[in-house]
């Protein structure tokens, strides 16, 4: 009996998570990504904010920039020039959209310990970067691109047509930033800094979304964003390259668009430099099932860029859209013409292929009923990539090395057995030539970052092990987590179940489904998290489940492309199917089941609540899409085609939340949205509310004034407190 008595007394000293813990970020973790500057050196910002250079081989470290210098301009970020002569310091950070922000930049000269005076940079700057070699600067100011040969030099203006909300040079417009490039920049230096490539986006003809920003003034401001919704006019993109050695000599040269792409509406999807005189551009038809990779060469005689048809590689999907979320980007080999790329194999799984002359002749490098996720690095003898192959868990990520310098190429899992229970979800960061690399493990245990030798894979040192977090969690009753699968009608539904600490299968628990469910997403991942749902399980005794249904990623094209042109159908069906299976498990109180989601998850939760199944007592939709006609063209059309009669208008109309207004009558619905949501416009929730009012259906709602899609800051606390009250009330849990 003694051990059991000790166990009980230990449990009594442990406490459940509180909502305050979550809102205060008490149990957040740290990761360590080295800022590599060579094969064996990296920079890191120390705890006291000094910028320190570490040399792995000598074991030495020294401060290259003191916290005093950082503080003198209130810098929150920095960037060392490749010749190590200068550092830019970034301050006055002002967020714009998901990736974009403006800032003030100061250049610090390391050789004399002073800030560069004369020809200072204008403010605020939209984007700034060093050339990959030396210390040239390229920056974007007021939608135009400027070049400096040295930080103290006067700038050379490359573009002159930049205009707010009209012409964007070197930076993306809203839709390219959010849905195509996923960056704040649209300019790319060639490997040795000879050329600078950039995109020009012309938004002149794009319809504008306008919404009020209330602020503190007597009159609200109106925010105007050129935002192409499904079927609307899209940005017109052009790619230019300028010789930065003699920028005035011939000026920017436009890169030709492949003829098969230029024949109708198209997108530019990414640019990859191969050598200083060879560049690879990827293009996509507006109907996003055809992608063309075009390799272009510099013609010295004409000072132009030539993209021969023989160097055009077409990637086409016959079962869905091209690629996963985005079309994958190539990783070039040392011959500077052949490359490695992830795309679907004949069995419908995304795998690494080696392409030399044609895509038809591609050599498949990885294969199996799992997917290659990312190619990190290709060296002369090794290719490093991540996949979810190990033990057939799609929600894991391990790092593999394929020896490509010999035949047959041998494969080794670098991470599978390192910390098997603690670490099942990795990413990696490589130094030049993959001499060293950092592994960042995200869970399921407490995250840990380690440094490794690129030849032997030996662990050199622990970079961050989150000891304080480990100690803080020692007296916390964390919920239990299970990742399992359901087999239903030839579909595998992976789920994560979060169970109360003293879970007892013979008891009945309220169930909350947390859903995202968007195309090419994955919610069931072996990662560490102490968040709101952890609290709901730990303190409030709820069971929470996340389910990856049709349309989700990394389990093959059959599952991924099942939702093609039919958003809002199978994602919802699969959540409902899973709930029925959970009820069959015997520990769910079927009178107390709720569903909640944010963004795409808000759309799915709304449709699930309005499915008429009677399964859900209540639910929450945060910033939901309510009609695909209201969302961005690039994202929506990828999965839905066009909202035209001769394409897919019928399903656009059939898949709205508003069309199901009547069905909300028998559920408790909480609808939440930020009024300044630039992404999923407040319009979406306004239309749901209007439809519910017109149908005389009661519901609850909360708006967050001047908040965007992230509902950050104090709104976060208010949001989670409000949702907690709603759920506790729904589940008849005492406050």
């Amino acid at each position: 009996l003694r051990p059991s008595r000790v166990h009980n007394s230990e449990e009594n000293t442990m406490r459940a998570l509180t909502l305050k813990d979550i809102l205060n970020g008490t149990f957040s973790y740290k990761t360590f990504f080295p800022n590599w500057i060579s094969g064996q050196e990296y920079l890191h910002q120390s705890a006291d904010n000094n910028i320190v250079l570490y040399n792995i081989e000598t074991g030495q470290s020294y401060t290259i920039l003191s916290n005093r210098t950082m503080k003198s301009v209130n810098a929150s970020n920095y960037g060392l020039s490749p010749d190590r002569q200068f550092v830019y310091l970034e301050s006055d950070y002002s967020k714009l959209w998901r990736y974009s922000y403006t800032a003030t930049y100061y250049i610090y000269d390391l050789s004399n310990g002073e800030f560069v005076r004369g020809n200072e940079l204008p403010r605020p700057i939209q984007y700034l970067c060093w050339s990959p070699v030396g210390s040239k600067l390229a920056y974007v100011y007021q939608n135009n691109i400027y070049l400096k040969q040295r930080p103290g030099d006067p700038p050379f203006q490359i573009t002159f047509n930049g205009r707010e909300n009209k012409i964007f040079n070197g930076i993306p417009d809203w839709v390219y930033e959010e849905e195509m490039l996923a960056t704040k920049y649209a300019l790319w230096w060639s490997p040795n800094g000879k050329f600078l490539a950039y995109a020009e986006f012309n938004d002149t003809d794009i319809p504008v979304i306008a919404y009020s920003y209330y602020g503190d003034e007597q009159y609200p401001r109106t925010i105007n964003i050129p935002y192409p919704k499904a079927g609307a006019k899209n940005p017109v993109v052009r790619i230019f390259i300028i010789d930065t050695t003699y920028p005035a000599y011939v000026g920017p040269q436009e890169v030709p668009v492949p003829a098969m792409i230029a024949s109708s509406d198209y997108y530019f999807s990414w640019l990859t430099w191969v050598t200083d005189e060879r560049v690879c551009l990827q293009w996509l038809k507006r109907v996003q099932n055809v992608s063309v990779l075009s390799i272009c060469d510099f013609r010295e005689d004409w000072q132009t860029w030539d993209c021969p048809k023989t160097q055009e590689h077409i990637e086409e999907s016959r079962t869905g859209w091209a690629g996963g979320f985005f079309v994958s980007t190539p990783v070039f080999s040392y011959d500077a013409i052949s490359y490695y790329k992830i795309f679907s194999d004949k069995d419908g799984y995304k795998h690494i292929h080696y392409i030399k002359d044609t895509v038809e002749n591609a050599i498949q490098i990885t294969s199996g009923k799992w997917e290659a996720i990312n190619i990190f690095r290709v060296t002369q003898d090794s290719l490093f990539y991540s996949s979810n192959e190990f033990e057939e868990y799609p929600g894991r990520r391990n790092i593999y090395r394929i020896s490509i310098g010999s035949y047959p190429p041998s494969k080794k899992c670098v991470t599978c057995h390192l910390r098997k229970e603690r670490c099942q979800y990795y990413t990696a960061s490589f130094s030049d030539y993959a001499k060293y690399y950092a592994l960042v493990c995200y869970g399921p245990g407490i995250p840990i970052s380690t440094l490794h030798d690129g030849r032997t894979d030996q662990e050199i040192k622990i970079l961050e092990e989150n000891k304080e977090l480990e100690n803080a969690l020692k007296n916390i009753q964390l919920p239990k987590e299970e990742i399992k699968k359901l087999e239903v009608d030839e579909i595998t539904l992976w789920y994560k179940m979060i169970l109360p600490p003293q879970f007892d299968r013979s008891k009945k628990y309220p169930l909350l489904i947390q859903v995202y469910g968007g195309p090419c997403s994955q919610s069931v991942r072996s990662v560490f998290a102490v968040n709101w749902i952890s609290y709901l399980a730990s303190k409030e005794g709820m069971v929470i489940a996340l389910v990856d249904g049709r349309g989700t990623a990394f389990q093959g094209d059959k599952l991924l492309y099942a939702v093609y042109r039919k958003l809002g159908v199978y994602e919802v069906e699969d959540q409902i199917t899973a709930v029925r299976k959970f009820i069959e498990m015997g520990f769910i109180d079927e009178k107390r089941i709720a569903i909640w989601g944010w963004s795409y998850g808000g759309y799915v939760s709304s449709l699930a609540l309005a499915s008429g199944t009677g399964l859900f007592k209540c639910g929450i939709a945060v910033a939901p899409v309510s009609s695909w006609e209201y969302y961005a063209s690039v994202y929506t059309e990828r999965f839905m085609g066009l909202p035209t009669k001769d394409d897919n208008l019928e399903h656009y109309k059939n898949s709205t939340v508003m069309a199901r207004a009547e069905y909300f009558r028998n559920v408790d619905y909480l609808l939440i949205h930020g009024t300044a949501d630039d992404n999923v416009h407040f319009q979406n929730s306004a239309q749901i509310a209007k439809a519910l009012v017109n149908a005389q259906v009661d519901f609850q709602a909360m708006w967050y004034s001047d908040q965007n899609h992230g509902l950050s800051g104090l709104s976060t606390n208010h949001l989670y407190t409000h949702m907690t009250h709603f759920l506790k009330q729904c589940f008849s849990l005492s406050d």
């Epitope: 021969p308 023989t310 160097q311 080999s333 040392y334 011959d335 500077a336 013409i337 052949s338 080696y354 030399k356 002359d357 044609t358 002749n361 050599i363 002369q380 003898d381 490509i404 310098g405 010999s406 035949y407 047959p408």
Partner: antibody, heavy 122, light 106 residues
């Protein structure tokens, strides 16, 4: 020492068939791409085709695709060329060649046999 | 892809330097090999990747070029260098050979 020894050549009538063999020794045959190359009397070299180590990829020169079949038996360390529907222009010295893997993903013809002669005549 | 070799034949003396060229009908991106074939013998690999010497090949041989134009240079010709030379591309199948260059003693 690496050795490739072709056999099976000889006189064959137009429209007939013949199977050439290439016995390999002195290297790990099962890890090498192998090729067949021919040389008509007094003429240059003509690439016939190649086969990868596990026989999953076989490429031919288009004009010979329908009449020649390349295969291999790694257990016997032997490469084969099955010739059918032969014509007088198929008269040549037939070489088998094998080579090292060269990064990235191609193979040179480092080792050559001494060749076997095929004469097509009625 | 068609490989055009020139000259078709060439006479030179021991100690001389000679250059043989090979033109491809399309860009073969350095995927080129050179072979030497002596009378009555099998071909022997000299150069691959356009400029890398195969094991055991004397340093008087050198390969160069890019795109569609390639050449093989032999410095200070030795008696054993006489014979036929062939280029072959490895860019895409079929891996065609050039027509050959016959190098004879003057």
């Amino acid at each position: 020492e690496v050795q490739l020894l072709e056999s099976g050549g000889g006189l064959v009538q137009p429209g007939g068939s013949l199977k050439l063999s290439c016995a390999a020794s002195g290297f790990d045959f099962s890890r090498y791409w192998m090729s067949w190359v021919r040389q008509a009397p007094g003429k240059g070299l003509e690439w016939i085709g190649e086969i990868n180590p596990d026989s999953s990829t076989i490429n031919y020169t288009p004009s010979l695709k329908d009449k020649f079949i390349i295969s291999r038996d790694n257990a016997k360390n032997t490469l084969y060329l099955q010739m059918s529907k032969v014509r007088s222009e198929d008269t040549a010295l037939y070489y088998c060649a094998g080579g090292y893997y060269r990064y990235p993903y191609y193979y040179t013809m480092d080792y050559w046999g001494q060749g076997t002669t095929v004469t097509v005549s009625s | 892809l068609v490989m055009t070799q020139s000259p078709a034949s060439l006479s030179a003396s021991v100690g001389e330097t000679v250059t043989i060229t090979c033109r491809a009908s399309g860009n073969i991106h350095n995927y080129l090999a050179w072979y030497q074939q002596k009378q009555g013998k099998s071909p022997q690999l000299l150069v691959y990747n356009a400029k890398t010497l195969a094991d055991g090949v004397p340093s008087r041989f050198s390969g160069s070029g890019s795109g569609t134009q390639y050449s093989l240079k032999i410095n200070s010709l030795q008696p054993e260098d006489f014979g036929s030379y062939y280029c072959q591309h490895f860019w895409s199948t079929p891996y065609t050979f050039g027509g050959g260059t016959k190098l004879e003693i003057k």
